[in-house]
Interface confidence: medium
């Protein structure tokens, strides 16, 4: 037997697990595909990315809208020559998410 | 040219990207390795898991301490035989994290 309070708690948790934009730590270099002689400090930034659960296994949490936000980072060249330079780096920020079908696989692939 | 205020903003963001326990959505069935004829509703729960950035590429964010927390979920058997039952499910919750060296690779692997 279960009471309404227990169900409310379960429902609230479920709502929180749903597919939605959530703050995520992303590695800037991987994002930008920068050359190996340039790196960024901090190496990671916080942005919103789609994540969470979908009701069905055939669905995945995908972004439906994206904005690009500018983060101030130190761009450092190796070997170090000048004082590290602050540069604006644009990183994708997911603003909308939806549970969408995974891309159908070709029967012969 | 950058001022101290800019550096403070960067520093605050960097602190937030550090390796630490962060709320994550995990799929219960995968966690428990349950048989395919049993599934849970909600299928996902929120727990804390280690995540975030480490200063060096050779380090990864790993859990150093774990507690197990109980989540009330509906366990449903397929085919449905009885009323879904609320069961307590224990899920790992990371309480401490550290940037640790990745396992050294065997030279012949």
């Amino acid at each position: 037997f279960y009471d309404i309070e227990t169900l409310k708690v379960i429902d609230e948790e479920w709502q929180r697990t749903q597919c939605s934009p959530r703050e995520t730590c992303v590695e800037v270099a991987s994002e930008l595909g920068k050359s190996t002689n340039t790196f960024f400090k901090p190496p990671c930034v916080n942005v919103f990315r789609c994540g969470g659960c979908c009701n069905e296994e055939s669905l995945i949490c995908m972004n439906t809208s994206t904005s690009y936000i500018s983060k101030q980072l130190f761009e450092i060249s190796v070997p170090l020559t000048s004082v590290p330079e602050l540069v604006p780096v644009k990183v994708a920020n997911h603003t909308g998410c939806k549970c969408l079908p995974t891309a159908p696989r070709h029967p012969y692939s | 040219f950058y001022d101290i205020e800019t550096l403070k903003v960067i520093d605050e963001e960097w602190q937030r990207t550090q390796c630490s326990p962060r709320e994550t959505c995990v799929e219960v069935a995968s966690e428990l390795g349950k048989s395919t004829n049993t599934f849970f509703k909600p299928p996902c729960v929120n727990v804390f898991r280690c995540g975030g950035c480490c200063n060096e590429e050779s380090l990864i964010c790993m859990n150093t301490s774990t507690s197990y927390i109980s989540k009330q979920l509906f366990e449903i058997s397929v085919p449905l035989t009885s009323v879904p039952e609320l069961v307590p499910v224990k899920v790992a919750n990371h309480t401490g994290c550290k940037c640790l060296p990745t396992a050294p690779r065997h030279p012949y692997s």
């Epitope: 400090k41 901090p42 130190f74 060249s77 590290p84 | 001022d3 101290i4």
Partner: antibody
């Protein structure tokens, strides 16, 4: 408000080691991207960059003087220390502590160090 | 090391008249990131150097607009459109593109 102040002996003898301390306020050397460095200026001459230290303890030295210089920091005390070994009369100069940004904006007032027997 | 050569060494000026200082580097100051880290400082008598111009032509906050910087590659110029009495002192150019960061020998500006 950012301030930097140098302290150390006004007079050192040849072959001795010079130890200079920079005490700063208005910022922290634990802040991401922050650096503190040293620049000197012999009387009536040009400025010469010596060394600097970054928030994560990376250190950079002028290659010409590298073997004689050591820079270190005490973040909790807001201090950076420069030591220079085997002092010579040609090292007589005003030594400035600077906050390292690109370019140098905040400088200490400088401390004159004379090397003489 | 990058050698920074300033001319003239001394510059006697009349208040209200323009003044120009040249700075030449022994190597291009264009960084691989595209920026040129050439800066100008003024050291007034008995004081620490103060930043006037950064990255060739950007006036630092509070610096009067009579000061301007120009140039590229290895040749740079600081201009004062109308010299004032408070502008006396030694002007230094400086590069922070290449380690070690280096300074010019200075140009002493004095009132005639």
């Amino acid at each position: 408000q950012v301030t930097l102040k140098e302290s150390g002996p006004a007079l050192v003898k040849p072959t001795q080691t010079l130890t200079l301390t920079c005490t700063f306020s208005g910022f922290s050397l634990s802040t991401y991207g922050m650096g503190v460095g040293w620049i000197r200026q012999p009387p009536g001459k040009a400025l010469e960059w010596l060394a600097n230290i970054w928030w994560e303890d990376d250190k950079y030295y002028n290659p010409v003087l590298r073997s004689r210089l050591t820079i270190s920091k005490d973040t909790s005390k807001n201090q950076v220390v420069l030591t220079m070994t085997n002092m010579d009369p040609v090292d007589t100069a005003t030594y400035y502590c600077v906050q390292v940004t690109n370019p140098f904006v905040f400088w200490g007032e400088g401390t004159l160090v004379t090397v003489s027997s | 090391d990058i050698v920074m050569t300033q001319t003239p060494l001394s510059l006697p000026v009349t208040p209200g008249e323009p003044a120009s200082i040249s700075c030449r580097s022994s190597q291009s100051l264009v960084h691989i990131n595209g920026n040129t880290y050439l800066h100008w400082y003024l050291q007034k008598p008995g004081q620490s150097p103060q930043l006037l111009i950064y990255k060739v032509s950007n006036r630092f906050s509070g610096v009067p607009d009579r000061f301007s910087g120009s140039g590229s590659g290895t040749d740079f110029t600081l201009k004062i459109s109308r010299v004032e009495a408070e502008d006396v002192g030694v002007y230094f150019c400086s590069q922070s593109t290449h380690v070690p960061w280096t300074f010019g020998g200075g140009t002493k500006v004095e009132i005639k």
